[in-house]
């Protein structure tokens, strides 16, 4: 009786289950009543990373340095290659297919979280205390100066993108 | 019925090449894969490999990769088996046979100087 | 490469005995065993394939049987026509490999 459903890692093919071809291989030939299905090992830059009866191999993909993209993880039979971006850069998408470059908080904001090859950087506004007055990718919001610290008094009141100004206290004569 | 005929024995010499056809009939040829198996004097058989007309996929024996080319040409539904750099001990009935079940009637090939 | 032995390797008997060829792999193989009849001076011929199935046109005296790395052969009643060199191979993994043959004579 020829089956209907074929094991794991098989499939049905003129009513007979053939093996699939592992990772990393491709279908050269079906199985038949003489022979084992026939597969062969992916060539240089091709992959395959399921069980398949794939008769082509997939291309490795292509960190094009054009688009900012290098090689995070090269590729093998098996795996696809994992680009990333260049320092200073992220990637547009999960698929990681080209880089923009990082964002920079504007003066008033500082870094919440620093960019990486695969996330922008978060910017957040700073808080009342707290200041940041350049447009920068690392920066967080600086607090601001202390004036009763260091025996100063507040001659200038900070903002968001400025320090506050210390000077001397007044003296009575 | 199923016919494979091969072309007519051969005599080489050692270091040159020898290309053997095998034209198909009574079965749609592209369905089988065509296998080459060679057999030397007194001995028993070899697998050299097969390939699949379909899609022209040949697989090949590592004994003779790099020696042995597997071609087929549909529109007249022949198989070929080309064999590089004879030697004296790749003297042999050379057959194609129809994904292992059906045999041509073997090409002999002589090596000799 | 699976490496196929067969034993014996020539055997003589007499017409209507039975007679029993054995082929052993070096693994396993599953069912990817098939036997070939090759008489003197003749084209080899499939008798058997998949470890028990005739091929067309196949007298029902022989059959095969085994499982995994070992199988057999059977002639249930020698024929003078059976006189011939039998060889097993194995279709499961390549290269595809055949086994040194087993020649058979009448006695």
């Known amino acids: 009786e020829p089956p209907t459903a074929c094991r794991e890692k098989q499939y049905l093919i003129n009513s007979q289950c053939c093996s699939l071809c592992q990772p990393g291989q491709k279908l050269v030939s079906d199985c038949t009543e003489f022979t084992e299905t026939e597969c062969l090992p992916c060539g240089e830059s091709e992959f395959l990373d399921t069980w398949n009866r794939e008769t082509h191999c997939h291309q490795h993909k292509y960190c094009d340095p054009n688009l900012g993209l290098r090689v995070q993880q090269k590729g093998t039979s098996e795996t696809d290659t994992i680009c990333t971006c260049e320092e200073g850069w992220h990637c547009t998408s999960e698929a990681c297919e080209s880089c923009v470059l990082h964002r920079s908080c504007s003066p008033g904001f500082g870094v919440k979280q620093i960019a990486t090859g695969v996330s922008d950087t978060i910017c957040e506004p700073c808080p009342v205390g707290f200041f940041s007055n350049v447009s920068s990718a690392f920066e967080k919001c600086h607090p601001w100066t202390s004036c009763e610290t260091k025996d100063l008094v507040v001659q200038q009141a900070g903002t968001n993108k400025t320090d506050v100004v210390c000077g001397p206290q007044d003296r009575l004569r | 019925q199923v016919q494979l005929v091969q072309s007519g024995a051969e005599v080489k010499k050692p270091g040159a090449s020898v290309k053997v056809s095998c034209k198909a009939s009574?079965?749609?040829?592209?369905?089988?894969?065509m296998d080459w198996v060679r057999q030397a004097p007194g001995q028993g058989l070899e697998w050299m490999g097969d390939?699949?007309?379909?899609?022209?996929?040949?697989i090949y024996n590592l004994k003779f990769k790099g020696r042995v080319t597997l071609t087929v040409d549909t529109s007249t539904s022949t198989a070929y088996m080309e064999l590089r750099s004879l030697r004296s001990d790749d003297t042999a009935v050379y057959y194609c046979?129809?994904?292992?079940?059906?045999w041509g009637q073997g090409t002999t090939v002589t090596v000799s100087s | 490469d699976i490496q196929m032995t067969q034993s014996p390797s020539s055997l003589s008997a007499s017409v209507g005995d039975r007679v029993t060829i054995t082929c052993r792999a070096s693994?396993?193989?599953?069912?990817?065993l098939n036997w070939y009849q090759q008489k003197p001076g003749k084209v080899p011929k499939l008798l058997i394939y998949?470890?028990?199935r005739l091929h067309s046109g196949v007298p029902s005296r022989f059959s095969g049987s085994g499982s995994g790395t070992d199988f057999t052969l059977t002639i249930s009643s020698l024929q003078p026509e059976d006189v011939a060199t039998y060889y097993c191979?194995?279709?499961?993994?390549?290269?595809?490999?055949f086994g040194g043959g087993t020649k058979v004579e009448i006695k």
């Open positions: 046979v129809r994904r292992l079940d059906y």
């Open positions: 009574g079965y749609t040829f592209t369905d089988y894969n």
């Open positions: 390939i699949n007309p379909k899609n022209a996929g040949t």
């Open positions: 693994q396993d193989i599953s069912n990817y």
């Open positions: 998949y470890i028990s």
């Open positions: 191979q194995q279709g499961n993994t390549l290269p595809y490999t």
